[in-house]
């Protein structure tokens, strides 16, 4: 099989995030530039016919063209050690250093990069490159989709005809890897909350690095953290009212630790919402703020949004709980003009408290108004 | 989930043509080289051709140069193999496969030469 | 033409112990700073080939990790550590390094 999508997220992975060069013409730039171009030809044999292929060369030519990078030089030395693919191992470790990803990750180079994506309330998302969204996504959609780990939620109506939705259930495939956990599910419905996974066990079953998946319970029926060691990863799953909520820590090289673009690279969390599933609520925050609850039946995704919740008092429940005026505070705000349903807040104050404990940039725990963003 | 289903095979005489077809879903089918891949009755697999994503290049095996032509229509997610002054040893199942190194496959179709 | 040579010829082995197959090419099959294209196929009685194995020793998605292959250069193994019924068959080598592509002619595997 082709593999010129791991040569795309090393280079994606060398030149953003924390450790990316300071400016695109950067000898730093231009040296990850010479590392793509020379991936992509290791890997013409097996992709010489596919688009990704092509994309991929023409992409490094207009690139080293654009920024003037020699083709000789030097090339970056890859930031990121390699994943094998799951259960591509092909000799045993006795050693639980492999199911430690930061362990092993540090004998090769820097920390690892670590993402964020969470989802909540009506629902909003926030995805893994900080791009925050209002969706409509009714039924199942998968919210991650890669080589490790498969998370899929199925989202229900807020109220009868509303376009509005919110998570009442969630379903995590963590997938068979090497020497450190056989696969395991778990899954959370309305009223719900395990903390264990479908077979009743706790972690990663009888392999030697089986306490690298672990699952523990932070408030009965209300709040559960999966820790996945071996891919550096960290789950919250909240109940909060009738409602679920999900966020995530997670590397960048696991992020993109996709076979196949075309039918995993869809998820969620890495591409946003399809544009046809997105609410402009920025739209209809600033209808609502000029003309009060009464206009709301011609921004609101929910026709049958109570009027009994005036704006005013939406506003003061939220600041109480949000008091920065991000967007956390303002999906608050909608979520509780288009529901009525004041858990709504606590939905919006718990993502936020997760944003705080999950995001690896503290500088970009708040996300202010602007343009709505396009898929990725 | 990937499916290529084949078509087209049949009895036909030695120096006649025919037009295999593979009919793909599961995946973008104009992003990917697709093969085809032939087997003789019980013998193993001999490479026949593939195709670029776009029909820009196209590879053959010796034995069908000149003979066989491969093509797509990307609108249609179908892949064609036209056989031209068809011999008696092409009697085989052809396969078509997608990528540019074939990962999955078709069930493939039998193909007889014969007078 | 690259030849792949493949042994043995057929191979009967019991459930549970391990089979072993090898295939030698007529050149080496390294491409690039060691990036080497040799795959392996499973053809199941009355089925298509399904892929195992590509770039030597990369388990194809879905495949056991009993499916081990490892090898360099023009030598390349296949070992079954535990051998179970769905896994007779034909296994066929197949190089994508040089044009055109080759397969090897086929290591049948048979339950003892």
């Known amino acids: 099989p082709c593999k010129i999508l791991k040569c795309n997220s090393e280079f994606w992975s060398a030149t953003s995030g924390s450790h990316a060069p300071a400016s695109d013409d950067t000898p730093e730039f231009c040296a990850a530039l010479r590392s793509y171009a020379l991936c992509t030809r290791r890997t013409a044999r097996t992709c010489r016919g596919d688009l990704a292929y092509h994309s991929a060369v023409h992409g490094i030519e207009d690139l080293m063209s654009q920024h003037n990078c020699s083709k000789d030089g030097p090339t970056s030395q890859p930031r990121l050690r390699t994943l094998p693919p799951a259960g591509d191992s092909q000799e045993r470790s006795d050693s639980p250093e492999i199911c430690h990803y930061e362990k092993s990750f540090h004998k090769h180079s820097a920390t690892p990069n670590y993402t964020h994506c969470g989802l909540f309330g009506d629902p909003h998302l926030r995805t893994f490159t900080d791009r925050f969204q209002t969706c409509k996504v009714q039924g199942a959609w998968p919210l991650i989709d890669n080589n490790y780990l498969n998370v899929q939620v199925t989202n229900t109506p807020v109220l009868p005809g509303s376009a509005a939705t919110a998570t009442s259930k969630l379903t995590i495939i963590f997938k068979n890897f090497q020497e450190c956990v056989d696969q395991k599910v778990y899954q959370a419905e309305m009223d719900e909350l395990p903390a264990a996974f479908v077979d009743g066990s706790k972690n990663g079953g009888d392999k030697h690095g089986a306490n690298s998946l672990k699952i523990t319970e932070k408030v009965s029926g209300q709040h559960v953290e999966i820790q996945a060691k071996y891919i550096g990863t960290t789950i919250v799953v909240r109940q909060v009212g009738r409602y679920l909520t999900f966020a995530v820590r997670m590397p960048e090289e696991v992020v993109n630790a996709v076979e196949d673009w075309d039918s995993q690279g869809l998820y969620l969390c890495l591409r946003g919402c399809p544009l046809n599933q997105q609410i402009d609520f920025q739209a209809f925050h600033t209808n609502a703020e000029g003309t009060g609850a009464r206009r709301l039946a011609a921004a609101s995704p929910a026709p049958t949004a109570p009027e009994t919740f005036p704006y005013e008092t939406a506003v003061a429940k939220c600041k109480e709980k949000l008091p920065v005026e991000d967007l956390y505070y303002q999906a608050c705000v909608f979520d509780l003009l288009t529901t009525g349903d004041v858990n709504f807040t606590l939905a919006a104050y718990y993502a936020l408290e997760d944003v705080k404990m999950l995001h690896s940039n503290k500088d970009k725990l708040h996300l202010y108004e602007r343009t709505r963003d396009l898929p990725g | 989930e990937v499916q290529l289903v084949e078509s087209g095979g049949g009895l036909v005489q030695p120096g006649s043509s025919l037009k295999l077809s593979c009919v793909a879903s599961?995946?973008?089918?104009?992003?990917?080289?697709m093969n085809w891949i032939r087997q003789a009755p019980k013998k193993g697999l001999e490479w026949i051709g593939m195709?670029?994503?776009?029909?820009?290049?196209?590879h053959y095996a010796d034995s069908v140069k000149g003979r066989f032509t491969i093509s797509r229509d990307n609108s249609k997610n179908t892949l064609y193999l036209e056989m031209n002054s068809l011999r008696s040893e092409d009697t085989a199942i052809y396969y078509c496969?997608?990528?540019?190194?074939?990962?999955?496959w078709g069930q493939g179709v039998m193909v007889t030469v014969s007078s | 033409d690259v030849v792949l040579t493949q042994t043995p010829v057929s191979l009967s082995v019991t459930l549970g112990d391990q089979a072993s197959m090898s295939c030698r090419s007529s050149?080496?099959?390294?491409?690039?700073?060691?990036?080497?294209?040799l795959e392996w196929f499973l053809q199941k009685p009355g089925q298509s080939p399904q892929l195992l194995i590509y770039e030597v020793s990369n388990r194809f998605s879905g495949v056991p990790d009993r499916f081990i292959g490892s090898g360099s250069g023009t030598d390349f193994t296949l070992k079954i550590s535990r051998v179970e019924p769905e896994d007779l068959g034909v296994y066929y080598c197949?190089?994508?390094?040089?044009?055109?592509?080759?397969f090897g002619s086929g290591t049948k595997l048979e339950i003892k």
């Open positions: 599961g995946f973008t089918f104009s992003n990917y080289g």
């Open positions: 050149q080496s099959l390294e491409y690039s700073d060691g990036y080497t294209f």
């Open positions: 197949f190089q994508a390094t040089h044009d055109p592509l080759t």
């Open positions: 496969a997608k990528g540019t190194t074939p990962d999955y």
């Open positions: 195709i670029y994503y776009d029909s820009s290049e196209k």
